[in-house]
Interface confidence: low
Amino acid sequence: QTSVSPSKVILPRGGSVLVTCSTSCDQPKLLGIETPLPKKELLLPGNNRKVYELSNVQEDSQPMCYSNCPDGQSTAKTFLTVYWTPERVELAPLPSWQPVGKNLTLRCQVEGGAPRANLTVVLLRGEKELKREPAVGEPAEVTTTVLVRRDHHGANFSCRTELDLRPQGLELFENTSAPYQLQTFVLPATPPQLVSPRVLEVDTQGTVVCSLDGLFPVSEAQVHLALGDQRLNPTVTYGNDSFSAKASVSVTAEDEGTQRLTCAVILGNQSQETLQTVTIYSFPAPNVILTKPEVSEGTEVTVKCEAHPRAKVTLNGVPAQPLGPRAQLLLKATPEDNGRSFSCSATLEVAGQLIHKNQTRELRVLYGPRLDERDCPGNWTWPENSQQTPMCQAWGNPLPELKCLKDGTFPLPIGESVTVTRDLEGTYLCRARSTQGEVTRKVTVNVLSPRYE
């Protein structure tokens, strides 16, 4: 009778084992071991026992001891079970960003590992087990479906293998895959709201605002704002689930025409875009041309208004005839025209919008001087010793210099409060003088003596 020791072995892959083959008869004709494994016989006294060192055990094996005794031949097998942890434990690659509400399939692949009966594959979210299955097949594959939720954002999913050899008196061997960090996101189906001027004048700045609500996580949203090929640099402010990107846009003559304004919001692996057209236009203020800005009374003045070739102008509220970019007004300058404003209003249609520009010029009319009865009465009669203020106002542009003298020397104190005396009586010659000429007017002051009763 042949026996073997040990009859069952669980050993690490590549390990060695000492196997003893024995026979019950004292003088066996034959005693040995049959195995494809490298073996080395250890010398022992006696004939009925042999010890072999089996090395580099890579897989499960069943070496067989045999003996040939007088009563016949017999065999005995030992069962070598090799254990090893998997060579590869990994989650199938997935995009790191997943939209909320999507079914996400986690797939764990396990290559190698033995004994398979003791090998379990566990899918985890953090430390929470999602699925546990025995490893079957090569490679073994375990899958589970997860409905992506907002609170999964930043969660780590992993796959763990458990080679449980504790029932065999060994330990629990664990191998864990590299974690997959899930980034969840919500990008609404509505495109971003883009608020911008529909038309923008060359050499001016406009403000563009792009906003979107219902984003998660809003801080991860990327905003791209561009006008044509010009990337804008927005200032982004975030709310709980919204953002607002505000940018200044400057345009030059090179940008003139229709430009495309784009706001793209990128979150996760999705994007939403809004396009708008902005018309860049050039429209200088109209030109108001006076033949001369300063003229003498009675001069004929031409007021011209000229604007952009496609503009329509009105001069002092009256449209050009025929309607177009030029208007003209002709007048004879009167004192009433001094300080008169000539306003040219030009209107240009740009992309369906009416743009208005104004220019105003003021006409200065030189006239005078004037001294008339209303403002410089020719006769004053005042009681003696009363308080009076002689008034005489000369008119003209430029304002005339006024002097009122009696006998060429005695001045009348115009605009000053005086006590009326006899010397104030008499005829004064008031002379108003300016660059436009001079006028004179006689003013008589009568002084009434008090009556004594």
């Epitope: 031409t302 002092n316 509220g317 009256v318 005839q321 025929p322 177009g324 030029r326 208007a327 002709l330």
Partner: nanobody
Framework: QVKLEESGGGLVQPGGSLRLSCAAS????????MGWYRQAPGKQRELVAR???????AYEDSVKGRFTISRDNAPNTVFLQMNGLKPEDTAVYYC?????????????????WGQGTQVTVSS
């Protein structure tokens, strides 16, 4: 309504003369510059001569010494006396005027054009 009416065009032999007239009518207060433009087939319209209110005249180089522009402010008429005509003077001649019309709130200037008169210089 302002109207400019040209007359005096026609067929003339090289070296010959023509006198074009243009009369302005309508609610005219006064007329600033008046002028003559011409357009030969397949070419751009070009200024021939222009005359201001006070009678200052300006001419296109090719017509200097041959053409004379004049005006009569009383009946609002402008004339173009064309002497020494050449085949290259063949064109439609248009009258142009900056006309001031009286409006309720002031006077307005408009640039008006006539319908054109054909001048053909050929032997």
């Amino acid at each position: 309504q302002v109207k400019l009416e040209e007359s005096g065009g026609g067929l003339v032999q090289p070296g010959g003369s023509l006198r074009l007239s243009c009369a302005a009518s309508g609610s005219i207060f006064s007329i600033n510059d008046m002028g003559w433009y011409r357009q030969a087939p397949g070419k751009q319209r070009e200024l021939v001569a222009r005359i201001t209110r006070d009678g200052s005249a300006a001419y296109e180089d090719s017509v200097k010494g041959r053409f004379t522009i004049s005006r009569d402010n009383a009946p609002n008429t402008v004339f173009l006396q064309m002497n020494g005509l050449k085949p290259e003077d063949t064109a439609v001649y248009y009258c142009n005027a900056e006309i001031i019309t009286t409006q309720t709130l002031g006077r307005m200037l408009g640039e008006y054009w006539g319908q054109g008169t054909q001048v053909t210089v050929s032997s």
